[in-house]
């Protein structure tokens, strides 16, 4: 039966009507409107934008639109005492100072309240000392420094280039290495694509451009002062010393012109290999300290930022479902930006706005979705996914019982080459089927499907003729829904060609130059890629909310579970002797995966054959599909990461942005050869295999016939 029959509506109100209502020109108009002034979390400007969106969503036709506010810990520079870094001579005189602000882009010279570049949640401090260059400050970079090069970072200020991993992991690694300060900078090797001009003449990062960002290690906690619970009016708040995830050493970001001044004087050890060299005209010496003539000079940081409990506002819109109003499909993206938010987040917020408008238009014509759709404009994402996490903490009981799916809607573009999708395996078939029905916006693929251009440009490494779909990691607002609550989640955006553009993210990410003009002039003048992303995100929401049988295929989970089990087994098998010595076996895990595969197959057969006109049986089957993702949640969470509770996926312990499969086992095996107590270490591996095997088996049993 078609999804229309469930809600007894006229045939014209189907997916096609919804998609046809989406217009590129509207997305363009909304993006312009959202990017004219900064919308930093906790500011009056962002509160006003929340109220504007609330008002417009009501006009678009949603049943209700409410503001949900929380009082969370945020971080701001001191307006009268700016942050900067100096080179000081032996007399303590400052002979060089880093820039105090980015030169504003043309047309924005008179805009007030542009927050200068800073590392949010850096403690205050004025450390001085010798510099050590630590490449990307990844786990492996510190291994190279400490183990191979015998360079001690203790008591040093480290300078690391942005890219490859989440900046919070860089800071954590530096802290663990004993550093007393961290300088983060954008190297042209990572943020300047060859053959492209810097902004405003192109989309590359100018030398004075700086990436802002938080440096927390929250591990899914939300507000650092109220982990696990909403930061509401009667919240009990931890003291700052007990706050979750705050860095303990000063951190500050700079651009590559300023970095050049610090790096050109570096002495000490030469870089270990070419992977430690960027594109600046400097030797990329590791240090410690400056060379010959400059050996008496030191680096001094001046950081005066403050942490403040501040009110934030989510906008929550509801479109009530006609048949299953107690089943929620959520479309959410953040509203707060570091400055203008031309790409992050407003290219996503503009798409959400147009999706809401299209759904509202259908509703005004008498249509309703089968299930309830919730729309969210999250606040304070840039400060640690705070708005989404606090709302989910407040509504966790409802969400865990009623949450069907969460679709994330941050930046719609990070390039204009092809589609990029990260999602639960349950959504693979939904994404494939949807993209086969959408037109590709790509040059050279006129009249072809999005699926075709996507598959050609970004092929799956495992399955020929299929596109790449990646694991969910974190660093965005789906985190609490997927990693903590076990709600099936997905995200989609247009991306760059990773083969030819090896820089990290997009060059102007979190800089003052992320403007409307950046998008309109250089990334998507016709807004055709934005429209395609709107169709993908909106189409997923439409199907999830309106299809009679949930568009989840549990067999795809079976396939990836086998792949992940094979992968973790091969990692463990790098230590065959220890596996034998400590009787480490993966038999239980492979057995559970086999059982899951068989049960999922049988469930899928039943799904084809059952009587869809029987609402009780339909609801029962749909509940088994809805609760499958939930079944992968371990209520005890992962070791030392209680809010990462998904046993199959978690953000990598070494890079929050990346997803890791069987993370409990992976972390237990990581660097196991260096553990002081191998018996204990391998015991933990065995325990994690047990947890994973049990969880997979338990999840499989939720798909078995109920009686």
């Amino acid at each position: 039966k078609s999804s229309n029959e469930a809600t007894n509506i006229t045939p014209k109100h189907n997916m096609k009507a919804f998609l046809d209502e989406l217009k590129a020109e509207n997305i363009k108009k909304f993006l312009y409107n959202f990017t004219q002034i900064p919308h930093l979390a906790g500011t009056e400007q962002n509160f006003q934008l929340a109220k504007q969106i609330q008002s417009q969503w009501k006009e678009f036709g949603l049943d209700s639109v409410e503001l949900a506010h929380y009082d969370v810990l945020l971080s701001y520079p001191n307006k009268t005492h700016p942050n900067y870094i100096s080179i000081i001579n032996e007399d303590g005189n400052e002979i060089f100072n880093t820039s105090l602000f980015e030169p504003p882009p043309p047309g924005y010279e008179n805009v007030s309240d542009i927050v200068p570049p800073f590392s949010a949640f850096s403690p205050q401090g004025m450390p001085e000392g010798d510099l050590v260059y630590v490449n990307y400050a990844r786990t492996e970079d510190f291994f190279k420094l400490e183990r191979d090069m015998k360079i001690n970072c203790s008591g040093k200020i480290v300078i690391a280039r942005y890219g490859k991993v989440f900046r919070g992991n860089k800071v954590k690694n530096a802290q663990l290495a004993g550093a007393k300060g961290v300088i983060l900078y954008s190297d042209p090797a990572d943020y300047f694509a060859p053959g492209v001009k810097s902004y405003p003449d192109g989309w590359n990062l100018p030398g004075g451009g700086v990436q802002r960002g938080n440096i927390l290690n929250l591990n899914g906690a939300g507000d650092p002062l109220t982990p696990g619970y909403p930061a509401n009016e009667y919240a009990y708040r931890r003291g700052i010393a007990e706050a979750v995830g705050l860095p303990s050493i000063p951190v500050h970001p700079i651009g590559y012109y300023d970095a050049q001044k610090l790096l050109e004087k570096m002495g000490g050890s030469a870089p270990p290999d070419s992977s430690w060299r960027g594109s600046l005209k400097v030797p990329y010496n590791v240090g410690p300290g400056f060379t010959g003539n400059f050996s008496t000079q030191k680096v001094k940081m001046h950081i005066h930022s403050t942490n403040e409990v501040t009110r934030i506002y989510n906008v929550i819109g509801t479109l009530r479902g006609a048949v299953e109003p107690d089943r929620y499909v959520i479309l959410g993206g953040h509203r707060d930006s570091w400055v203008f938010g031309g790409i992050d987040p407003q290219s996503g917020a503009a798409v959400v706005h147009e999706i809401v408008r299209s759904f509202g238009t259908l509703k005004k014509e008498g249509w309703r979705p089968r299930r309830t759709i919730l729309f969210a404009s999250w606040d304070a994402e840039e400060f640690g996914l705070l708005g989404s996490t606090e709302w989910a903490e407040e509504n966790s009981r409802l969400l865990q019982e009623r949450g069907v799916a969460y679709i994330n809607a941050d930046s719609s573009i990070e390039g204009n080459y092809t589609l990029r999708v990260d999602c639960t395996p349950l959504m693979y078939s939904l994404v494939h089927n949807l993209t086969k029905e959408l037109k590709s916006p790509d040059e050279g693929f006129e009249g072809k499907s999005l699926y075709e251009s996507w598959t050609k440009k970004s092929p799956s490494p495992e399955f020929s003729g299929m596109p790449r779909i990646s694991k969910l990691g974190s660093g965005n607002d789906f985190e609490v829904f997927f990693q903590r609550l076990g709600i099936a989640s997905g995200r989609a955006r247009y991306t760059k060609n990773w083969e030819t553009n090896k820089f990290s993210g997009y060059p102007l990410y979190h800089s003052v130059y992320e403007t409307y003009e950046l998008v309109e002039k250089f990334y998507d003048p016709m807004f055709k890629y934005h429209l395609t992303v709107a169709q993908v995100r909106g189409g997923m929401v439409f199907e999830l909310a309106n299809s009679i049988v949930l568009p989840f295929d549990c067999r795809d989970y079976a396939v990836v579970l086998r792949k992940y089990a094979d992968k973790i087994y091969s990692i463990s098998m790098k230590h065959p002797q220890e596996m034998k010595t400590y009787s480490v076996s993966f038999d239980s895990l492979f057995s559970a995966v086999k059982n899951f595969t068989e049960i999922a197959s049988k469930f899928s057969e039943r799904l084809q054959d059952f009587d869809k006109s029987n609402p009780i049986v339909l609801r029962m089957m749909n509940d088994q599909l809805m609760f499958l993702e939930r079944a992968f949640i371990d209520p005890l969470g992962l070791p030392d990461r209680p809010f990462y509770r998904h046993v199959i996926y978690a953000p990598s312990s070494h890079n929050k942005y990346a997803g890791e499969s069987f993370p409990g086992i992976y972390d237990a095996l990581f660097d196991i050869e260096s553990k002081v107590d191998p018996s204990k270490a391998w015991g933990e591996v065995k325990r994690q295999i047990y947890v994973a095997a049990f969880t997979v088996q338990a999840a499989a049993e939720t798909l078995s016939e109920v009686a």
Epitope: F96, N97, S99, F101, P103, G207, G209, P283
Partner: antibody
Amino acid sequence: EVQLVESGGGVVQPGRSLRLSCAASGFTFSSYGMNWVRQAPGKGLEWVAVTSYDESNKYYADSVKGRFTISRDISKNTLYLQMSSLRAEDTAVYYCARDPYSSSWNGAFDIWGPGTMVTVSS
Amino acid sequence: SYELTQPPSVSVAPGQTARITCGGNNIGSKSVHWYQQKPGQAPVLVVYDDSDRPSGIPERFSGSNSGNTATLTISRVEAGDEADYYCQVWDSSTDHVVFGGGTKLTVL
């Protein structure tokens, strides 16, 4: 049109002071590093001073350090060179020049003014 | 302090290639910029960052830089190229701009 125009030159006695101005137009003055360069009659180019776009860094040639001060007024789009304790060897055409990269102040000089002549003579 | 050495003069026939050198200790590790100055006029940037050309400068002007020598090359020299040419670097050890002494290019 992007341009720089110097003014304030003239004849001045040794030991006295003079302030040169450089009016900028056609670009976002507050985003660029700015320099003063001089050229004595029949001689080569000699750099005098630089200020970064946000004035967080100012550097001077050894020959003028402690006597000359570079500054800028963003509201007036003007660069200044305050010269004191002038000497005969300061006689030169003084040019103001812009760094070609927004936010840089130690690169090349892509825009030059026509220059203003300063003569230090008793 | 850092010093840049240029030949005082270079002569070349029209249509030929002129090469003006700029010597400095390990100059290859620095970014070199070149200026053309005609009598009574302000200098004009012709090459920056070793080898990049500003818009409006003919392709005949090119630069290279390695080791202890940077070179400005003017191919198919024209009479209008006759001028003084200066090389320039930033000396990070003193935080000073340094100019070469200049080279007078004569077109025969």
